[in-house]
């Protein structure tokens, strides 16, 4: 099938160090079907950024970007 | 722009453990993986393990019981050490830059390799 | 632990289009093997050119194209030029590790 060919973007491991809030433009959660929970932050330059989710930081943004949406 | 430099002793006696320094510029440690691969002459590569952002890591579980890979963030350098070495331990150890979403590349940039020899 | 094969050799005209297979002892490859094509040039240059199965990393030519053809990851040169002509390695992830195909010598005369 199409769907299964289509790469679904996981996160092998998470940055270390939070990213500056006013680099965030925007963010997706991964797939249920990656083997590990993630956040995509995409930044201001176009690059994307594996998060934890669990982090404090990670779900602030999260929920910034949501009011802000 | 995106370096990383491999330094190692280039001459090892057999049962003695090896030490490798890959030094990376251009990019942090904290949001990037490091890949470890060798390569024995005339032969292909061989992924020995990995070490992410928070210092996890992940080996070839032929070689897991000999293997261990760290780091320091501060002086943007990762460190293999393998110990017992033999003979078929000869080979190029190369050091890859490993971004962290399954859909880039994930041995992206690449050292240009330090030469291990194991010998007597 | 899994054995990744690959063609030992290859060879191809300028302009021709060849294709570089990459299969798993353990079963068909899938998207969640993350197939990554890596291409080595003399003096131990080595640059990552696909990865996730079928994107191309930054300034890779767009004649390079990953894909999963029957049970098996794939690389595609469309048009090879006399510069493609290398040593082609895949590797496939595991779950927790990494496992490389024995690569594919690409002769382009």
């Known amino acids: 099938s199409l769907a299964a060919d289509t790469p679904t973007a996981c996160c092998f491991s998470y940055t270390s160090r939070q990213i500056p809030q006013n680099f965030i433009a925007d963010y997706f959660e991964t797939s249920s079907q990656c083997s590990k929970p993630g956040v995509i932050f995409l930044t201001k330059r176009s690059r994307q950024v594996c998060a934890d989710p669990s982090e404090e930081w990670v779900q602030k943004y999260v929920s910034d970007l949501e009011l802000s949406a | 722009q995106v370096q990383l430099k491999e330094s190692g002793p280039g001459l090892v006696a057999p049962s003695q453990s090896l030490s490798i320094t890959c030094t990376v510029s251009?990019?942090?440690?904290?949001?990037?993986?490091i890949h470890w691969v060798r390569q024995p002459p005339g032969k292909g590569l061989e992924w020995l393990g990995v070490i992410w952002p928070g210092g996890g890591t992940n080996y070839n579980s032929a070689l897991m019981s000999r293997l261990n890979i760290s780091k320091d963030n501060s002086k943007s350098q990762v460190f293999l050490k393998m110990n017992s070495l033999q003979t078929d331990d000869t080979a190029m150890y190369y050091c890859?830059?490993?971004?962290?979403?399954?859909?880039?590349?994930?041995?992206?940039?690449w050292g240009q390799g330090t030469s291990v020899t194991v010998s007597s | 632990q899994a054995v990744v094969t690959q063609e030992s050799a290859l060879t191809t005209s300028p302009g021709e289009t060849v294709t570089l297979t990459c299969r798993s002892n353990t079963g068909a490859v899938t998207t969640s093997n993350y197939a990554n094509w890596v291409q080595e040039k003399p003096d131990h240059l080595f640059t990552g050119l696909i990865g996730g199965t079928n994107n191309r990393a930054p300034g890779v030519p767009a004649r390079f194209s990953g894909s999963l053809i029957g049970d098996k990851a794939a690389l595609t040169i469309t048009g090879a030029q006399t510069e493609d002509e290398a040593i082609y390695f895949c590797a496939l992830w595991y779950s927790n590790h990494w496992v490389f195909g024995g690569g594919t010598k690409l002769t382009v005369l």
């Open positions: 251009g990019f942090s440690l904290t949001g990037y993986g």
């Open positions: 890859a830059r490993g971004p962290l979403i399954t859909t880039e590349v994930s041995m992206d940039y």
